[in-house]
């Protein structure tokens, strides 16, 4: 059998006066009791109605009643001021039963045909209530055949009486330092049969203050204290209330950080409730006085628990706790009314004594030893032998505590050695090898390490030499014994330098010609520049104009002399540059392989011979005077030549340095 509701048997039918449609007799009394199933009512209407009309229907009438209530007393054919005929009206029972009584008196002045009526049971819509009557349900009413049910809005639950909606108003916890809470639906009437609990729970150290605001309306009683609805306030110290009636309760200073508010309502009444605005206070901390040259933010009238302030220093002043710097400072007020950190100082920024400048000096401009904010210092390089690299040397103590140049640089200026200074101011005539005098070739470097070789000082920590001269030591740089500042090869008086690394041109192939015969040695320490130790300049772009054929260059070294021994004293020779084609042709004949002279080489010497560099001079510089700058520069590096030095028709071959400027600059900048 299919499941589902069991519908009641249908209730419907017809009623009529005795003898209908004929006239009814006198002295008739007839009663019908109609009953519908629970949850249903009866509907009745007349299709015919013709009864004797009398004042207030005293003689003949049809009376409709439901329970104890008379719904209508009907007579006549049409309604008058004092009598009612049914006309087209429909009549409804109040519950599930309807009584119909027909009565005729002892006489009729004329014949009356009585009535005919039809009835039927129909569902009662319990959700429809007459104006002024209490609604069936608190919130939502749902009608169905034979009955109804109630439901509630979100935040409410249906009471066990199945009609009232009780508010779900417990368990709310307020943790902010201030806020508002109110009875449910405020300012509309609060719900019935509800028990609400609100908690204010602040951090220890705070004290809650309650203010009742706007209006207060809670059901009361003239004699008994709040017997129906009431509001109570509980703290860990005491209970306040109960409160009811229409008077706003006074402010409550709870002196507690936790408060429980209870609101209980009964099943009746129509009252708007209450609203509380709560705030909190705490023991204030001492008012923060800003240190000199500082200010407090934010500025408040008072600072209580969890309030904080920060200190900001004026430009040029910094936060210090004693000697220790702080980037920022924020103090927080604690529950005992003390700050969690002591006040720092705003001290004038002190950049401290400026760093020493290698090969230079510093001068205090603002005042002797003044190193505070906006103080000015002036760096300068040791005159004659050093010059300052792209910097005017003026530094200011800035607010960040660093000495800063006019270009915003915080690093020290660089004192670069002046290059190409020599006691010789011009190239000499072509004459035999000469002994060098002090300061003639201050760039000259003596390299010992297996063999004797030479090099030229670049800057104050690099040596330019020939690749073949240091090839054997490329993996053991520390084996190189580097000497400078002396004329005598065997003198004990010299400046010692040691190699940190050897860089051989990647295009150089040992024992396969001398192309790319160039190397750089990085010294492990800077050397002090003076009149006997000065770097050689690298050629400018325009340098080739001083290195044309027949222009005079100067080679220097301790290499083999005409006697066949290494020179004891530094020697030099002035030699002209030889036409490149002429030099190439000179080395095309055996025993020299074709292509010995490349575009990376330049040749110098006399066709007649006798003036040349020789073994032991390898790696030394062939230098030229730049007449525009009046500085000497390296044009060539002693590389190779004929088996017999100074041989007629043969020339000394030198690495052409101008071809290697990018390589030299890259190595020096990278390392």
């Amino acid at each position: 059998t299919p499941l589902g509701p069991k519908w009641p048997e249908p209730v419907f039918g017809r009623l009529a006066s005795p003898g209908f449609p004929g006239e009814y007799a006198n002295d008739q009394e007839r009663r019908w009791t109609l009953t519908a199933p629970p949850g249903y009512r009866l509907r009745l209407y007349f299709t015919h109605f013709d009864l004797e009309l009398s004042h207030l229907c005293e003689y003949d009438f049809v009376k409709l009643s439901s329970g104890a209530k008379v719904l209508a007393t009907l007579c006549g054919q049409e309604s008058t001021d004092t009598e009612r005929a049914p006309g087209k009206d429909t009549f409804y029972s109040l519950g599930s039963s309807l009584d119909i009584t027909f009565r005729s008196d002892y006489s009729n002045e004329k014949p009356f045909t009585g009535f005919e009526a039809f009835y039927a049971a129909e569902d009662i819509d319990e959700c429809q209530v007459a104006p002024g009557e209490a609604p069936t349900c608190d919130h939502h009413c749902h009608n169905h055949l034979g009955g109804f049910y109630c439901s509630c809005r979100a935040g409410y639950v249906l009471h066990r009486n199945k009609r009232t909606c009780s508010a779900l108003c417990s368990g709310q916890v307020f943790t902010q330092r201030s806020g508002e809470l109110s009875s449910p639906e405020y300012p509309r009437p609060y719900p019935k049969l509800s028990s609400c609990t609100y908690s204010i729970s602040l951090e220890e150290g705070f004290s809650v203050i309650l203010d009742f605001v706007e209006s207060f309306d809670v059901e009361t009683h003239p004699e008994t204290l709040c017997p129906y609805d009431f509001l109570k306030i509980q703290t860990d110290r005491e209970e306040h209330g109960p409160f009811c009636g229409k008077t706003l309760p006074h402010r409550i200073e709870t002196k507690s950080n936790t408060v429980t508010i209870t609101f209980v309502t009964d099943e009746s009444g129509d009252h708007t409730g209450w609203k509380i605005h709560y705030t909190s206070t705490a023991q204030p901390c001492p008012y923060p006085m800003a240190p000199p040259n500082g200010h407090v933010s934010p500025v408040q009238a008072k600072y209580i628990l969890k309030d904080s302030f920060s200190i900001f220093c004026e430009t040029g002043y910094e936060l210090l706790q004693g000697h220790l710097p702080l980037k920022s400072f924020t103090a927080v007020c604690q529950k005992d009314g003390s700050w969690d950190r002591p006040m720092p100082a705003c001290s004038i920024v002190d950049c401290g004594p400026p760093d020493d400048l290698p090969s230079g000096r510093v001068e205090y401009i603002t005042g002797p030893g003044v190193t505070t904010y906006k103080a000015v210092i002036q760096y300068s390089c040791e005159e004659t032998f050093y010059t300052m690299k792209v910097n005017d040397g003026k530094y200011v103590c800035e607010a960040d505590g660093f000495w800063t140049s006019s270009k915003g640089e915080k690093s020290l200026p660089v004192c670069e050695p002046v290059c190409g200074l020599s006691a010789r101011t011009t190239g000499g005539q072509i004459y035999g090898g000469q002994k060098a005098k002090p300061g003639d070739f201050p760039w000259q470097v003596l390299i010992l390490g297996g063999t004797t070789a030479a090099g030229a000082l670049l800057y104050d920590n690099w040596v330019l030499t020939a690749a073949h001269a240091v090839y054997e030591q490329k993996h053991d740089a520390s084996a190189l014994d580097i000497r400078m500042g002396t004329l005598k090869r065997l003198s004990p008086h010299y400046t010692q330098a040691w190699s940190e690394a050897v860089f051989i041109h990647e295009g150089y192939t040992h024992d396969a010609g001398f192309d790319n015969d160039i190397a750089l040695i990085k010294l492990n320490n800077k050397v002090v520049i003076n009149s006997n130790i000065t770097p050689i300049c690298l050629p400018r772009k325009e340098a080739e104009s001083f290195m044309r054929t027949d222009d005079i260059g100067t080679a220097s070294g301790w290499g083999l002399t005409q006697r066949g021994f290494l020179a004891r004293n530094l020697m030099y020779v002035d030699i002209p540059i030889v036409d490149h084609q002429k030099c190439t042709a000179a080395y095309e004949k055996p025993p020299y392989p074709r292509g010995s002279v490349t575009a990376n080489m330049l040749c110098a010497g006399l066709e007649s011979g006798g003036k040349d560099s020789c073994r032991g001079d390898s790696g030394g510089a062939l230098v030229f005077l730049d007449s525009e700058t009046e500085r000497w520069f390296v044009g060539g590096i002693v590389s190779w030549g004929s088996m017999n030095c100074g041989e007629a028709g043969q020339y000394g071959v030198y690495t052409k340095v101008i071809n290697y400027i990018p390589w030299i600059e890259n190595i020096i900048s990278d390392f």
Epitope: Q321, G322, P325, L326, K327, D400, G401
Partner: antibody, heavy 114, light 107 residues
Framework: QVQLQESGPGLVKPSETLSLTCTVS?????????WNWIRQPPGKKLEWMGY???????SYNPSLKSRITISRDTSKNQFSLKLSSVTAADTAVYYC???????WGQGTLVTVSS | EIVMTQSPATLSVSPGERATLSCKAS??????VAWYQQKPGQSPRALIY???YRYSGIPARFSGSGSGTEFTLTISSLQSEDFAVYFC?????????FGGGTKVEIK
């Protein structure tokens, strides 16, 4: 959780340079504070060597000024100590710490000996 | 430099008793003083900064006081874990300096 950890060789030869690094986790060394190097020779009291601040400024103990360098590598959140020309008197447990000592490394013993 | 002198060098106290440690600065250091506890083989542990401010996590039995040149660290009721060496430290001026330490031992 702020943590500091010293690292570096435990043995250094006389006249060489002592190098130590302090790696900081849980806090950026550029955010705030001074970052110190402090040492404690065996059986002796603590000695402050110097600091590098959040901004990169340094302050050194005058007794060490000619030999000490404190630097930092912000990309690695590290600061370093270099002490040149060491002698046996530089043998100590070396600590790095923050500001006025709220956080310390566990310390590393450096012995100066040939 | 500012010299920090601690006294006594050794303090013998029974557990549960009060210990008072003194530190004197050779010059005015304001309240720029910190106190540390150090146990053998361990790095120092910060207790107090700015003379009287206790670091979070440090038990309330430790308290600091003083300003100018005289400072005190008080341990109200010594626990077994409190037996250690205690250092004071001034950070008022360069060079920052430490006291020689007070060893608190069990009586």
């Amino acid at each position: 959780q702020v943590q500091l950890q010293e690292s570096g060789p435990g043995l250094v030869k006389p006249s060489e340079t002592l190098s130590l690094t302090c790696t900081v986790s849980g806090y950026s060394i550029t955010s705030d504070y001074a970052w110190n190097w402090i040492r404690q020779p065996p059986g002796k009291k603590l000695e402050w060597m110097g600091y590098i601040s959040y901004s990169g400024r340094t302050s050194y103990n005058p007794s060490l000024k000619s030999r000490i360098t404190i630097s930092r590598d912000t990309s690695k959140n590290q600061f370093s100590l270099k002490l040149s020309s060491v002698t046996a008197a530089d043998t100590a447990v070396y600590y790095c710490s923050r500001h006025y000592g709220d956080y310390w490394g566990q310390g590393t013993l450096v012995t100066v000996s040939s | 430099e500012i010299v920090m002198t601690q006294s006594p060098a050794t303090l013998s106290v029974s557990p549960g008793e009060r210990a008072t440690l003194s530190c004197k600065a050779s010059q005015n250091v304001g309240t720029n003083v910190a106190w540390y506890q150090q146990k053998p083989g361990q790095s120092p542990r910060a207790l107090i900064y700015s003379a009287s401010y206790r670091y979070s996590g440090i038990p309330a039995r430790f308290s600091g006081s003083g300003s100018g040149t005289e400072f005190t660290l008080t341990i109200s009721s010594l626990q077994s874990e409190d037996f250690a060496v205690y250092f004071c430290h001034q950070y008022q001026s360069n060079p920052l300096t430490f006291g020689g330490g007070t060893k608190v031992e069990i009586k």
